[in-house]
């Protein structure tokens, strides 16, 4: 079994490992999230994503988590267990992103653009919160991201 984000295949990443890393810090992260009325990875970001669109969307989302979320949170936490879990998630996200090569062909532009508009909905919601709250919420929503990604884990 492997991830199939449309035409983009990802080998060597097992969802179970991602879930185990997240579960180790889930309660801590979600308990720290004080803004329960808002959601970053809202339904409209992830629903009805076509297979072709999924490669672009997962690429932009994981890159954002790597460059903005994990990177900034790493500088803010000293708790060893938390750091270890997020290192596991980050390393696996790097492995996934390194294998994703979304098509840059012109005929794919409408699919690519739609994926970027979905991503912007997420990023704008993230940027509206203060940094600490946004990071905590994004980390607490990794389960939403993993649940969506798991749909693309196929034989």
């Amino acid at each position: 079994q492997e991830f199939h984000f449309g035409p983009c295949q990802v080998k060597g990443v097992v969802p179970q490992k991602l879930w185990e890393a997240f579960w180790a810090v889930k309660d801590t992260m979600q308990a720290q999230d004080n803004i329960t009325s808002a959601r970053l990875l809202q339904q409209e970001v992830l629903q009805n994503v076509s297979d072709a669109e999924s490669c672009y969307l997962v690429h932009t989302l994981l890159e954002f988590y790597l460059k903005t979320v994990f990177k900034n949170y790493h500088n803010r936490t000293v708790e060893v267990r938390t750091l270890k879990s997020f290192s596991t998630l980050a390393n696996n996200f790097v492995l996934i992103v390194s294998q994703l090569q979304p098509s840059q062909e012109n005929e794919m532009f409408s699919i690519r653009d739609s994926a970027h508009r979905r991503f912007l909905l997420f990023r704008r919601a993230f940027k509206q919160l203060d940094v600490e709250a946004a990071l905590t919420k994004a980390l607490g929503e990794v389960d939403i991201l993993l649940t969506w990604m798991q749909k693309f884990y196929k034989l």
């Epitope: 912007l120 909905l121 940027k127 509206q128």
Partner: antibody
């Protein structure tokens, strides 16, 4: 191809609320993942982004106008609207509505002139 | 609020090449700012040329191209035409809002 048409009063008195509507034809405002923006241009000056309503109905505004701006939509009429409160003569401008490509406007209305004067 | 900077004016000879740039007061412009470029002639609504750094809007001639050059977004017009004389604006996404540059007046002479 999508077309946009702004409408509303051309003259607004200071301290009142400016209300404009953008009617969209050639496609539903709820189809796809598009966002819908308002931009204005004071006479002889550059473009100023005012705000956007995303396809899920969430709204985002320019920090400098946030306290006075509200964008909403009426999906049954295929329209979205701008309200700008407590206007002053500095709000005199051509107001444009647009459908975003990605992040920035793609298709523009032809614009409507709004003058703030007593 | 972030400030987006553009050259106030530039000129180009017909058939020549010109590059307009778009900078950000708070640092480098990246593809994550989704740079857009717009053309406006007097009395007309703006027209979108480029979005998402380098994607040409429908119907835009191939002589217009967008890129990131150094720490700025860039619009290059290759083989400028007299009808390209206009004001050009860039726009950058700054997270939860968008900011336009002050515009560049391009003269074709």
């Amino acid at each position: 191809e999508v077309q946009l048409q702004e409408s509303g009063p051309g003259l607004v008195k200071p301290s009142q609320t400016l209300s404009l509507t953008c009617t969209v034809s050639g496609g539903s405002i709820t189809t796809g993942t598009y966002s819908w923006s308002w931009i204005r241009q004071p006479p002889g000056k550059g473009l100023e982004w005012m705000g956007v309503i995303a396809y899920d109905g969430s709204t985002y505004y320019s920090p400098s106008l946030k306290s006075r701006t509200s964008i909403s939509r009426d999906t049954s009429k295929n329209q979205f609207s701008l309200q700008l409160s407590s206007v002053t003569p500095e709000d005199t401008a051509v107001y444009y509505c647009a459908r975003d490509d990605v992040a920035a406007p793609g298709y523009w209305g032809q614009g409507t002139q709004v003058t703030v004067s007593s | 609020q972030a400030v987006v900077t553009q050259e106030p004016s530039l000129s180009v000879s017909p058939g020549g090449t010109v590059t307009l740039t778009c900078g950000l007061s708070s640092g480098s412009v990246t593809t994550g700012n989704y740079p857009g470029w717009f053309q406006q002639t007097p009395g007309q609504a703006p027209r979108t040329l480029i979005y998402s750094t380098s994607s040409r809007h429908s119907g835009v001639p191939s002589r217009f191209s967008g890129s990131i050059s150094g720490n700025k977004a860039a619009l290059t017009i290759t083989g400028a035409q007299p009808e390209d004389e206009a004001d050009y604006y860039c726009a950058l996404d700054i997270g939860s809002y968008v900011v336009f540059g002050g515009g560049t007046k391009l003269t074709v002479l």
